[in-house]
Every structure is written in C-alpha cells, then in structure tokens.
C-alpha cells in the first residue's frame, strides 16, 4: 500500500499556503483527485509529489494515491481543507446525474471542518427540501440524497452557518434519470389495413418510454415518412405519436409500414401491411372437403373462412334438404374474428340423426355481393340385413337385402346345424357376391343391395347366413330351413335403431 506524507488523514491550511503531498510506493504511483487549479504534479523515482504554492478553497478535497501495478489495488488518501473565511464551500460539480433509487452525492466540500455542525441542504432561492427527502452529510464528500427519485431533480445549494448567518454554496443541479428497462414500447394501428382506391385511411405509430430521450419514425417500404410528431406525458410515461392520414388512397400507398423507436437501450420495430384494392371483395373458403361423410350418431363441425372488405352486412347457415325443412339452430352457429378482414364461421352438428344428412350452405353478404359455400353431408350406416325364401323362375332362391352406407358387400355362408350365426368350425361353404344388385342409391340415403342364392334343395339340418359389411360395421341374417317351411333369424345384436 502506498504511503502519503504528511501521514495524517486530514490537513487544514490557510489560503495562499504551500502544500506538498508526497506519495511513496514499491513501484510507480499515481495521484487521483478532483481536477482543480494550481496543482503541480511531478515524479521522483518511486514517489510522486503533488504540490501548490498558492492553495485556494478550490483545492479542498480528498487526494488518493494508488499503485497501478499493485494487483490488490491498495491506495492511501489524505483530505485537504483550505480554510477560507469567505468561502465555506468548494463545490466540485455543476451537475450530478444519477439513476432513480441510486444515492446522489452533491459534492459540496466544507473548507473548514469546524463548520460541520451548522450545515444544511436547501433548494435554490431558500426553498425547503421536498417531503421525504432523506439525506446525510460528510465534510469530506458533501450531501448524499438517499434513493433519489425523479421528482427530486432540482437545483440545490449547501448552507453553512458562519458567524450567525447562513452562507450558501453555488448551486448544483441534480438530474435523476429514470431507469430505462429497454427500448421504447411500440404500437402500430391498425395491424392490417385494406381500403378501396379513393377511400380515406389512417395509420398511427406511437412509442412510449419512462425517459424523454427516444426517437420514433414511420417508414413506408423502407422510406422514412416526414410526419409531424405529437408528444404527451401521462401515466409517468413520455409518448410520441405519428399519425399518417390519407384522404384518398391509391395503389402507391399500399405496402409495408414499419413503426420504429429507439433509445440508448436499443431499437424496437413493428410492421403492418396496407392493401389497396379496386373494389369490394368477399371470398369464402374452407380447409375442409366440401363433401363430408360422418357415421350416424357422431358429430361434425363445418368451418368456413371469410375474407371480406368492407365488413359483412349479413351471414347465415341454411339447410338445403333433402330430408326436412328444418334449419340449423342459431346457437350451434359460431363466429370468430381472426383479424379485421378474416373471420371463421363454424356450424356445430352434434350426434347426427338420419334426417340431418344433406346440403348445408353458408351465405354471406357485403357491398361486393352475395357469396355461398355449400357442404354435402352424407351419413354412414352399418348394414341392415334381411333374408327371405322365394321361387324365381321356378327355382328356390334365398333373397338377401342389405341396406347401409357406404354400399355393403355381401357374403353367403352355409353351415351345419341350426345356429344364429355360423362360426368357422361349422362352415361348409362360402359364396362371395362381388356384384350384388343395387336396388336404391339416392344421394344422402342408404344404399340398398340385393343378393340371390339359388338353392336346389334346402338341407334341413343346416343354416344359410347372409352377411353384409361396410366401413362402418356389419350385419347378418340366418335362415334355418325347417320341415314346416323356413325360419329366418336375425341375430339380436344386429338389430339397429338409429
């Protein structure tokens, strides 16, 4: 650690005195202190001498000697008082700049330690300090305002009692800066804009920050726009607003608009797109297939995306048949707005009944006209089967009718014994009918097919079974010949009640 001579913590001298402060260290040493007049600094080997032959009140201060090469960074200090009866204060700063909640040191140094008892801090022109100003005093350093607030940004003076009267220092301006958390906050409205050529438009770019020192500008396709700026201060924030007003838009006004704000912490930007169109438009689309197939009893949501400008004047869902004249319940229709010009309309169809198959149309209207988007909803059903014994052209024939959607496939089985359903061990013969006759096939209805199995003689201890299946399920009907005639037997589990 360097050593200062004279080896006293503080030195009191009169104005005009010669002061010599010597600092000695192991290596080179440096003096540090407030830049002030009349000092001479010179080196003598491993010592450095700070001297003046005409000390003034301005030389009052703490002088520190450091050894730059010392890794421990040791230092020694001496405080010099130049006791001037006419000048109780040496003010080391015109201005003090701190951030909010930091301690603010107002460097009024007493030139005479004896005056410490009668010091006080005031605002200029003798005004008292603001309420809740918490401060302390050190004769070496001055007044410290603890946890300074923005509102305490004022001009202050230090006061000392000399011979019963108060003597003021020159003023010190305290600037308490707001802590800037980051770049200014930005808003650009609207987020998207569409206008028909000739209409008016407005784009507003605004930025706000706790500190007034920030810049904001609006640019169109990378060209900075010259727009007058409106400034405001509310909710403890500074606001700067740029408003672009266009009375009659044209195609050259279209494009990308960016709102950019910057301060010492960095830059923020946000963008929007302005579209100029020739006339009103209304576009309907769906991400879904317009032809829908759903199993009976299940639910379905039909979704339509609408892109429109100007806004919609009306919209509704309509059931176009063919089963009934019922209309979708309004409570099942839902509308959500993605943004100003895009909306999604959903029709919820829970637990679909056979009478709800058919065409559903979404209609929308705006000044550009009407548009419609129609979905076709077909219900899927598992097959229903029935078998009868008949004679066709004199031949005994088993006739199987299967009804369902999609169109069922038909398989005949002959098995030993009397049973409700043939199992593998009993099967004697299997016939696939690849092309059953289609009896009815109307849109949105079940498809009914018929399959014929010509049987020369019915074996009485055997069962004939017609099985039908499609993507939804399967159904079967067992035919058991008995001496008194024929007996048909649909298995219980395949009875179907929608």
């Amino acid at each position: 650690i360097p050593v200062i001579e004279p080896s006293v913590p503080e030195l009191v001298v009169k104005p005009g005195a010669t002061v010599t402060l010597r600092c000695v260290g192991n290596g080179s040493v440096e003096w540090d202190g407030p830049p002030s007049p009349h000092w001479t600094l010179y080196s003598d080997g491993s010592s450095s001498i700070l001297s003046t032959n005409n000390a003034t009140f301005q030389n009052t201060g703490t002088y520190r000697c450091t050894e730059p090469g010392d890794p421990l960074g040791g230092s020694a200090a001496i405080h010099l008082y130049v006791k001037d009866p006419a000048r109780p204060w040496n003010v080391l700063a015109q201005e003090v700049v701190v951030f909010e909640d930091q301690d603010a040191l107002l460097p009024c140094l007493l030139t005479d330690p004896v005056l410490e008892a009668g010091v006080s801090l005031v605002r200029v022109r003798g005004r008292p300090l603001m309420r809740h100003t918490n401060y302390s005093f050190s004769p070496w350093h001055g007044f410290t305002i603890h946890r300074a607030k923005f509102i305490q940004s004022q001009d202050y003076q230090c006061s000392a009692l000399m011979g019963g009267r108060k003597v003021m220092s020159i003023s010190i301006r305290l600037k308490v800066q707001k802590v800037i958390p980051g770049p200014p906050a930005l808003t650009l409205v609207p987020a998207e804009l569409v206008r028909i050529r000739g209409e008016a438009a407005q784009i507003v770019c605004s930025a706000s920050s706790v500190d007034v020192n920030f810049d904001v500008f609006l640019q169109h396709n990378n060209t900075k726009l010259a727009i007058p700026q409106q400034s405001d201060f509310h909710n403890n924030r500074y606001q700067k607003v740029l408003t672009l007003n266009l009375d009659q838009v044209d195609f050259q006004h279209a494009g990308n608009y960016s709102c950019v704000a910057s301060n010492v912490q960095g830059k923020h930007s946000t963008s929007m797109f302005f579209r100029v169109v020739e006339s009103a438009y209304l576009n309907l689309s769906s991400e879904q297939n317009l032809i829908q197939e759903v199993t009976v009893g299940e639910g379905l949501n039909l979704k339509v995306m609408v892109e429109a400008y100007p806004g919609l004047q009306g919209f509704n869902w309509t059931y176009l048949g063919p089963f009934s004249d019922h209309q979708p319940e309004p409570k099942l229709a839902n509308a959500t707005t993605k943004d100003t010009y895009r909306h999604t309309f959903t029709l919820s169809l829970p637990r679909l009944k056979p009478s709800e198959a058919g065409r559903y149309s979404f209609l929308a209207r705006n000044p550009g006209g009407w548009r419609a988007l129609t979905f076709e909803l077909t219900l899927r059903y598992p097959p229903e089967v029935s078998v009868i014994w008949t004679f066709i052209n004199g031949s005994g024939t088993l006739l199987c009718a299967a009804s369902g959607y999609p169109q069922p496939n038909v398989t005949w089985l002959q098995c030993s014994g009397h049973t409700d359903r043939c199992d593998e061990a009993q099967v004697l013969q299997v016939w696939d009918d690849p092309y059953p006759e289609v009896l009815s096939q109307e849109p949105f209805h079940k498809v009914t097919v018929q399959s014929l199995l010509t049987v020369e003689t019915l074996e009485h201890n055997q069962t004939y079974e017609c099985r039908a299946h499609n993507s939804v399920g399967s159904g079967s009907w067992a035919f058991i010949p008995i001496s008194a005639g024929a007996h048909t037997h649909p298995p219980d589990e395949f009875l179907f009640t929608p």
């Epitope: 003096w31 540090d32 202190g33 407030p34 830049p35 002030s36 007049p37 009349h38 000092w39 001479t40 600094l41 010179y42 700070l50 005409n54 002088y63 520190r64 450091t66 730059p68 960074g73 230092s75 080391l92 700063a93 015109q94 201005e95 003090v96 700049v97 701190v98 930091q102 603010a104 040191l105 460097p107």
Partner: antibody, heavy 117, light 110 residues
Framework: QVQLQESGPGLVKPSETLSLTCTVS????????WSWIRQSPGKGLEWIGY???????NYNPSLKSRVTISVDTSKNQFSLKLSSVTAADTAVYYC???????????WGQGTLVTVSS | QSVLTQPPSASGTPGQRVTISCSGS????????VNWYQQLPGTAPKLLIY???QRPSGVPDRFSGSKSGTSASLAISGLQSEDEADYYC???????????FGGGTKLTVL
C-alpha cells in the same frame, strides 16, 4: 493498462441528439475523473466535460445547456449526450481519463460523428 | 478561435532542435501548469508533458517543457522523422473552471 473505447452512431441529423458511450477496460471507473473532448477541423481540441463515478459533472460553459454526461458503474461506462446538434458539432469525439491537474493521461481512439441531414 | 495561441506550423531537419511556443493569460498558463500532447496522423492525442516539464514513462528525454509567466514552450532535440505530428498545449483555465487547448502546431521533419 487502462483502455477506453468510444461507441455510437457516426451520423446524426441536425436538431437531433448525439449519444456516445465510452467503455473503460483494464481498470475500474469507480475512481479517477473521466472526460469527453472533441476535435473539429474548425475549432481544434475542445474540452466538453468531466464526470466522477458518483455522477458529479462539470461542463464547458459554451456547451453546458446542451450536454449531459452520465456514468454507469455496473457496466464500467460513461456516456455523452449532446442535444440540438448542428453541422458545427461535426467532430472526432474522444473519451479520456483526467489528471487532477486538468490534463488527460489516457485517451480512446476517437469516433467521428458527422451532423448532416 | 483557441484560448491558447500556438504557431500553426514548425519544421526542422533530422537531428535539429525545434521549439514550439504556447501563449496564454493569467487565468490559465499564468496560474496553472501546462500539459503538451502529441497527435500522430490518424491517432488520438498522447500526453507528452504534464505539470510544465514532467514526462510520463515511455516518453523520450528528447522532449522537454518549460513555462515562464503566461507562456510555455515545448522543445524537441535530436529531431527524428517519427516526431512529425501535431502538438497541442493545454492548461487549466480558472475562468472556464476546466482545461483549455492551443490550436495545435503541425511539425514537419524536412
């Protein structure tokens, strides 16, 4: 060895605020006095102001109304703001460490700031 | 217009001794110490002399400073080509309460 590095925009528009930062390395900013000096072709070297780590500042009277120098000890940086700039503020701006006699022992390499629209 | 006055230019041949003058007033050089700076082309100024006649470590003893009344001078003996630079004087000014500079002298080594 103490090193100083200026940073900030090289071009500022008239009437706007010039903002520069000086980063100190190789030593703590929490001792010594720190300064901004500028050098313009027309006016030579001109002292702008001093700052101490506590935030105490002294400014050149000719610039006082437009200058703010602040310090951020946590980043070992001090900053200059010069408002309402004109073409006359075009200069190379230096940050430096001050001696108590008023001299400057260590300098940054300087940054040219041009004021132009 | 600089507060301290220096000749705009000076020149000398290698090996020669060159002196650069700096003139001020009672509020600066008259009552405070003088510093000299050397600025090589394209670089920042470097402290050459402080407190009238003190050399920082690393500055050759060819450079010396002196002060008398309200004037100061920088002497360079044994002039070398690498001494070609701008030289500035500076001093604390009591009325400004801060340092002032001279306008600079461009030294050319012929």
């Amino acid at each position: 060895q103490v090193q100083l590095q200026e940073s900030g925009p090289g071009l500022v528009k008239p009437s706007e605020t010039l903002s520069l930062t000086c980063t100190v390395s190789g030593g703590s900013i929490s001792s010594y006095y720190w300064s901004w000096i500028r050098q313009s072709p027309g006016k030579g070297l001109e002292w702008i102001g001093y700052i101490y780590y506590s935030g105490s500042t002294n400014y050149n009277p000719s610039l006082k109304s437009r200058v703010t120098i602040s310090v951020d000890t946590s980043k070992n940086q001090f900053s200059l703001k010069l408002s309402s700039v004109t073409a006359a503020d075009t200069a190379v701006y230096y940050c430096a460490r001050a001696l108590l006699t008023g001299g400057f022992a260590y300098w940054g390499q300087g940054t040219l700031v041009t004021v132009s629209s | 217009q600089s507060v301290l006055t220096q000749p705009p230019s000076a020149s000398g041949t290698p090996g020669q001794r060159v002196t650069i003058s700096c003139s001020g007033s009672s509020s600066n050089i008259g009552s405070n110490t003088v510093n000299w700076y050397q600025q090589l082309p394209g670089t920042a100024p470097k402290l050459l002399i402080y407190s009238n006649n003190q050399r920082p470590s690393g500055v050759p003893d060819r450079f010396s400073g002196s002060k008398s009344g309200t004037s100061a001078s920088l002497a360079i003996s044994g002039l070398q080509s690498e001494d070609e630079a701008d030289y500035y004087c500076a001093a604390w000014d009591d009325s400004l309460n801060g340092p002032v500079f001279g306008g600079g002298t461009k030294l050319t080594v012929l």
